[in-house]
Amino acid sequence: GLNDIFEAQKIEWHESVRVEQVVKPPQNKTESENTSDKPKRKKKGGKNGKNRRNRKKKNPCNAEFQNFCIHGECKYIEHLEAVTCKCQQEYFGERCGEK
């Protein structure tokens, strides 16, 4: 399964915050030249699509991680080059598979 294919990296931070796991998608050698200005949050007065022209790398949530989050929403964090799950209420765990 995905857990066997992709190495999970634990993110450790302040003790008061729940430690979560993110999964790093495999790297293609050509990806190191890519740039991205794509906004990920929709806000009033937010940006239009003009900054998306340099967007080359596909969001892994729409590809190999499409079904990764069992009871939650897949989120790709560009800064970390990693995928994490935003779980639905009552669910938790790396893939939101625990209740």
């Epitope: 190191s32 991205s36 949050r41 806000k43 080059e81 994490t84």
Partner: antibody
Framework: EVQLQESGGGLVKPGGSLKLSCAAS????????MSWVRQTPEKRLEWVAT????????YYPDSVKGRFTISRDNAKNTLYLQMSSLRSEDTAMYYC??????????????????WGAGTTVTVSS | DIVLTQSPASLAVSLGQRATISCKAS??????????LNWYQQKPGQPPKLLIY???NLESGLPARFSGSGSGTDFTLNIHPVEEEDAATYYC??????????FGGGTKLEIK
């Protein structure tokens, strides 16, 4: 001890080029996004560039886009900033900074939690 | 771009009193109830130092006299009681995932 040490600053003529380096130690370099931030002589802080953990994503403000290039060598724990077509308004103290972060409930919140001591870049004829 | 406006540009506060610094954003830096706003302290000849992250979280190891509050577009840094070593310039910064990542103009705190 977590440390960042910049080098490569100096005096350069307008239109010239310069490459800054930032040596990281005391932490797992490839687990953090990194940035360059500059401080103008008027003491204003300006974000200059950001690079993701593995280098796949780079970000720049319009003021430096096309002139500056951020890169990293995770094997050497080093961050770089290649600056070209330098202008007088690029004169500043340049800091490299680590992106500390919180990751919880699907949310990613980041901040500059570690800064280097800085290196001075002066663009003047 | 999100513009951060700090006020006042400078202030003088007596030892032991309260210092209040404001940071106003040109648009909301909140998302789903989370505020993406950080505060930094800078002393002469030194790099900035993280004080407060995510609007109200005090960085580890720092004294509790520093506190941050606010949401949306209005944020406040409070220092109480002010000590001599708090004389510095304070900056706010927004850290949404959408570049550019902007800073406020800074507030210089002098201790009387």
């Amino acid at each position: 001890e977590v440390q960042l040490q910049e080098s490569g600053g100096g005096l350069v003529k307008p239109g010239g080029s310069l490459k800054l380096s930032c040596a990281a130690s005391g932490f797992t370099f490839n687990s953090y996004a990194m940035s360059w931030v500059r401080q103008t002589p008027e003491k204003r802080l300006e974000w200059v560039a950001t690079i993701s953990t593995g280098g796949s994503h780079t970000y720049y403000p319009d003021s430096v886009k096309g002139r500056f290039t951020i890169s990293r060598d995770n094997a050497k724990n080093t961050l770089y900033l290649q600056m070209s077509s330098l202008r007088s308004e690029d004169t500043a103290m340049y800091y490299c900074a680590r992106h500390g972060y919180l990751l919880y409930d699907g949310y990613y919140e980041w901040y500059f939690d570690v800064w280097g001591a800085g290196t001075t870049v002066t663009v003047s004829s | 771009d999100i513009v951060l406006t700090q006020s006042p540009a400078s202030l003088a506060v007596s030892l032991g009193q309260r210092a209040t610094i404001s940071c106003k954003a040109s648009q909301s830096v909140d998302y789903d109830g989370h505020s993406f706003l950080n505060w930094y302290q800078q002393k002469p000849g030194q790099p900035p130092k993280l004080l407060i992250y995510a609007a109200s979280n005090l960085e580890s190891g720092l004294p509790a006299r520093f506190s941050g509050s606010g949401s949306g577009t209005d944020f406040t840094l409070n220092i109480h009681p002010v000590e001599e070593e708090d004389a510095a310039t304070y900056y706010c910064q927004q850290s949404t995932e959408d570049p550019p990542y902007t800073f406020g103009g800074g507030t210089k705190l002098e201790i009387k």
